[in-house]
Interface confidence: low
Amino acid sequence: LRPSRGNTKRALTLKDILNGTFSYKTYFPNWISEQEYLHQSEDDNIVFYNIETRESYIILSNSTMKSVNATDYGLSPDRQFVYLESDYSKLWRYSYTATYYIYDLQNGEFVRGYELPRPIQYLCWSPVGSKLAYVYQNNIYLKQRPGDPPFQITYTGRENRIFNGIPDWVYEEEMLATKYALWWSPDGKFLAYVEFNDSDIPIIAYSYYGDGQYPRTINIPYPKAGAKNPVVRVFIVDTTYPHHVGPMEVPVPEMIASSDYYFSWLTWVSSERVCLQWLKRVQNVSVLSICDFREDWHAWECPKNQEHVEESRTGWAGGFFVSTPAFSQDATSYYKIFSDKDGYKHIHYIKDTVENAIQITSGKWEAIYIFRVTQDSLFYSSNEFEGYPGRRNIYRISIGNSPPSKKCVTCHLRKERCQYYTASFSYKAKYYALVCYGPGLPISTLHDGRTDQEIQVLEENKELENSLRNIQLPKVEIKKLKDGGLTFWYKMILPPQFDRSKKYPLLIQVYGGPCSQSVKSVFAVNWITYLASKEGIVIALVDGRGTAFQGDKFLHAVYRKLGVYEVEDQLTAVRKFIEMGFIDEERIAIWGWSYGGYVSSLALASGTGLFKCGIAVAPVSSWEYYASIYSERFMGLPTKDDNLEHYKNSTVMARAEYFRNVDYLLIHGTADDNVHFQNSAQIAKALVNAQVDFQAMWYSDQNHGISSGRSQNHLYTHMTHFLKQCFSLSD
């Protein structure tokens, strides 16, 4: 007898996960025109593609890249030069420093003379020609041509005090989500940038042990909840004559400037019109300000009638961030996503005032991102299709028509394989790439922007498909459960030979942070996939109240009371899972990282007896210990006249006694710049004071991601042992 084909398949191993054996590829064209793009080949050549002529050639060889150990590149818009980036040195989530070399494509050699200093914090080309702006030692410099001497635009930059053109820690992580804070005007005439003054911000200091006799101390200006914040100013400089009048400061709207405020984003509308967004420190009021250049005054004017106010009465403004505007061709009207009267985030068209905004999309679903507005089309993503909040499809609205007609570009392309898309558009959307993340194998495709017809597959992960053929993957289900008028979406990962009549251990993986989403129709082969495949553990992820894309009522339920409903909803879901009949009630665990570590800790300390054990990796333990912009967005201020009481009530430490009847594994990196080790140190102290036994692991010199190869291997091996012991699974 021949063994059945199914028997030849093997389960995933932890090694598979740690080695990244089953990682997938995506393909994002680096657009350089309407129909041309660059892409770095697998052997590191930079290849030029013209979709229409089907021309393709190496614009920069891997040998040139290798000659300076370059890992990234950037082509100047006039196509005469390429910057090559090497010596990448990571700083925080987005920021890094690097060494930059300029390569002259016409002469086939590196530009000599006036070489760039090192390390540079940020560098970019102008949108036209080959001007260069860069940030070095917190100051901005300009080169009219790569071989020209640099012109210094700012002189105020000071380490850990004043940042020009790059954000400080809190703005990088919680507001801009970029490594830069400078923006060229479309014609390359003006350069706008932000100056962040951190002089009065308290410093977080932690040890970095390294290899030396004495540890180093890392100092970061880091405003925790209620602390002094950065002071921000926005400037614009004329780069044609930078020496002429120097940088011009852009005025802050009066209603914003009257109290503590944030700068939230900048969008160039035209060569002499710019749009700035500002936010009150109490983040329920956002102001969008449109400013114009007055040649006669050589100044930037932001008239009051060009200020648009967005306010939330039920929570905070925007989703995770306040949305940015997508301007029409007229450079006056724009499209923007904000909550409609029913509390669902939708696209609105603003011509004069926000009050007169025309709602473009509507329904009990949410518009998520506007990709591109052209003369006749608006492309956006939403989770409308078939009512699944965890899907993303791309839609086109024909804005020339009245009423506008809507078409789903992606809904039926590869319906089973692809339900979660993003897109990358050429300049005026003549062509675009679709990147599908799942639930099947990710695939990237190229499309005609007029007909939406697929032109080419860019990456379909054939190799991954082949290597997964002999793997027993778990079955993934996305369903919803109802409880007392609330609907909770969940993802369940079931072991390969799942049998409903049997009992399985259950692991809840939780994040649960405000405006997050865990239940997404995406492909993944990760640690929990392994736990289901090899160890026979049922995994569940549940999106409780506070999570995104299901309307403001659901989202804002957690406003000013973090740590309550997120936990309650995980517990509700666990009880429902038990009712399904295939969960072993004696073997239920929960784990989470960061916000998920906070929720898993509170769930373990809920006193319900539902959980046998759990793990918290790099948890927040008190919102007073976390960043001002984040904590205050959802919790208000930790002051007596605001929300201090709930700040104190919602700590993990306050529940130390309740850990007595669970097995708790607490893990943290000592060099965590984001959720400071302080958080876990305080949990440990509270548990010791309460004489509660627990397990702990620290990772020396590791940050919030605990991402170094050795540390990550150790971490997941350690957590696996802990779980298997908890579930009485043999090694």
Epitope: S41, D43, Q453, E454
Partner: antibody, heavy 117, light 108 residues
């Protein structure tokens, strides 16, 4: 201009071996998927083998285990090592550049392989 | 594997006439279809990709259409140099890439 030139064809006995070469100019082969397609006398086209930019190789069932595709990036040349040749392998063998991983945008003139005793 | 069936096997037409060649896939292949022209003693030449896009340098008398399982190559007005064998090829599901059996367009 893109050019592909095949060589190495000829008469070989059944069970014998042959190595075909395809020299490329006008583009760097290492960056693109390359393909071998054959055409038996008076017959249609049959895909034989392919190699991606990454070096991953693919074969038609009819040649799997007998043919090996490879590439020398420094010489910008593609190869097809053909072992255990059979009469039914008699064909003109074309080398072609693949656009992405889809269709074949540039072809060589072909080289004739005859397997006969 | 996906099987492509071309029809007719041979098409006898005069110069100036319109030629319509068909290619049917055994299962839907979206628009992942290419057409090639092969003249005697020559290598194939790419005519059409993605079912309807003309390759560089291909005269506009050649046009492709179709999606799913039914595809058509049309030559609006045959020129003497158009008499050749035409093949369709799918790249929806590979390996293997598969070709149709070919349609010979001959002078009547």
């Amino acid at each position: 201009d893109v050019q592909l030139v095949e060589s190495g064809g000829g008469l070989v006995q059944p069970g014998g071996s042959l190595r075909l070469s395809c020299a490329a100019s006008g583009f760097s082969m290492s960056n693109f998927a390359m393909t071998w397609v054959r055409q038996a006398p008076g017959e249609g086209l049959e895909w034989v083998s392919g190699i991606r930019g990454s070096g991953t190789t693919y074969y038609a069932d009819s040649v799997k285990g007998r043919f090996t595709v490879s590439r020398d990036n420094s010489k910008n040349t593609l190869y097809l090592q053909m072992n255990s040749l059979r009469a039914e392998d008699t064909a003109i063998y074309y080398c072609a550049k693949t656009w992405g991983t889809e269709y074949f945008d540039y072809w060589g003139l072909g080289t004739l392989v005859t397997v006969s005793s | 594997e996906i099987v492509l069936t071309q029809s007719p096997g041979t098409l006898s037409l005069s110069p100036g006439e319109r030629a319509t060649l068909s290619c049917r896939a055994s299962q839907p292949i979206n628009n992942y279809l290419a057409w090639y022209q092969q003249k005697p003693g020559q290598a194939p030449r790419l005519l059409i990709f993605s079912a309807s896009n003309r390759a560089t340098g291909i005269p506009d008398r050649f046009s492709g259409s179709g999606s799913g399982t039914e595809f058509t190559l049309t030559i609006s007005s045959l020129e003497p140099e158009d008499f050749a064998v035409y093949y369709c090829q799918q790249y929806y599901d590979w390996p293997p890439y598969t070709f149709g059996g070919g349609t010979k367009v001959e002078i009547k």
